[in-house]
């Protein structure tokens, strides 16, 4: 197909001469927005320690999530870390381990 107003739709990239829109390859690469990318973006591969929540399509990247008992911090998004098994002495658990947060502990009321 031809670009619309100079850009290509999600799931495509633009040709070098700017005259054509070329489909991304399902499961290999993707584009999420109207664009003038010369190459679609490479699909993410889930690491060991992660589960694939949804596969890569031509318009959406793979969605990976940390396995049960581990979480990904915003500060270090490149790896899943083990959740703590319990709270330190003098603290109580108020939040469970989730794929995006460690257990939450607060000080016991004295």
């Amino acid at each position: 197909s031809s670009p619309s107003e100079g850009l290509c739709p999600p799931g495509h990239h633009i040709s070098e001469d700017g005259r054509d829109c070329i489909s991304c390859k399902y499961g290999q690469d993707y584009s999420t927005h109207w664009n003038d990318l010369l190459f679609c973006l490479r699909c993410t591969r889930c690491d060991s320690g992660e589960v694939e929540l949804s596969p890569c399509t031509t318009t959406r990247n793979t969605v990976c999530q940390c396995e049960e008992g581990t979480f990904r911090e915003e500060d270090s998004p490149e790896m899943c870390r083990k959740c703590r098994t319990g709270c330190p002495r003098g603290m109580v658990k108020v939040g469970d381990c989730t794929p995006w947060s460690d257990i939450e502990c607060v000080h016991k009321e004295s």
């Epitope: 619309s4 107003e5 100079g6 850009l7 070098e16 927005h33 109207w34 990318l37 010369l38 190459f39």
Partner: antibody, heavy 119, light 106 residues
Framework: EVMLVESGGGLVKPGGSLKLSCAAS????????MSWVRQTPEKRLEWVAT????????YYPDSVKGRFTISRDNAKNTLYLQMSSLRSEDTAMYYC????????????WGQGTTLTVSS | DIVMTQSHKFMSTSVGDRVSITCKAS??????VAWYQQKPGQSPKLLIY???TRHTGVPDRFTGSGSGTDFTLTISNVQSEDLADYFC????????FGGGTKLEIK
């Protein structure tokens, strides 16, 4: 001669908003994909937004997505950048730029307008 | 994002000399690289696109080369008006720029 003239820059407090304009002449504005590119005080260049020739489609890097909106008025040969929730790291010279024919990159830039975000 | 690295922040040369400014991409970008010249107090001007194609009106003293991850802008017979910052840019995946190389004339 291709001419791109930016305006609207100024001093804004963090969290504030501002709208930049770019007046185009010397070419058929409505036929060209346009972008905004900024240059930090340290001279680093960063692409900020792109809009299709007719104005129907836009795209942005994650750093400004949801805060900046690019638009155009082809009847007035003018490109706009609406900026909100401004941060100190948005301080830069803002250039409007044209995507060239069959080169898929910027061929002409305006002279720029300066945005300073500071309390 | 693709990172473009210009390892030399400054380069010094003399009028009449030949100088090569290099740029490295963090992944293969084919030949989707442009070079811009920015003179003091001015906006960037396109010199080279598709790694080696000279833009309209650019003197043939400016030559671009490279593909994949390694790119070079060569200025032969350097003139005093070539005093400027030079930036590489990849446009295969969105657009990212190198940090720039300032060319100083001795």
């Amino acid at each position: 001669e291709v001419m791109l003239v930016e305006s609207g820059g100024g001093l804004v407090k963090p969290g504030g908003s501002l709208k930049l304009s770019c007046a185009a002449s010397g070419f058929t504005f409505s036929s060209y994909v346009m972008s905004w590119v900024r240059q930090t005080p340290e001279k680093r260049l960063e692409w900020v937004a792109t809009i299709s020739s007719g104005g129907s489609y836009t795209y942005y890097p994650d750093s400004v997505k949801g805060r900046f909106t690019i638009s155009r008025d082809n009847a007035k040969n003018t490109l706009y950048l609406q900026m909100s929730s401004l941060r100190s790291e948005d301080t830069a010279m803002y250039y409007c730029a044209r995507r060239g024919d069959s080169m898929i990159t910027t061929d002409y830039w305006g002279q720029g307008t300066t945005l300073t975000v500071s309390s | 994002d693709i990172v473009m690295t210009q390892s030399h922040k400054f380069m010094s040369t003399s009028v009449g000399d030949r100088v090569s400014i290099t740029c490295k991409a963090s992944q293969d970008v084919g030949t989707a690289v442009a070079w811009y010249q920015q003179k003091p107090g001015q906006s960037p001007k396109l010199l080279i696109y598709w790694a080696s194609t000279r833009h309209t009106g650019v003197p043939d003293r400016f030559t671009g080369s490279g593909s994949g991850t390694d790119f070079t802008l060569t200025i032969s017979n350097v003139q005093s008006e070539d005093l400027a910052d030079y930036f590489c840019q990849q446009y295969s995946s969105y657009r990212t720029f190198g940090g720039g190389t300032k060319l100083e004339i001795k």
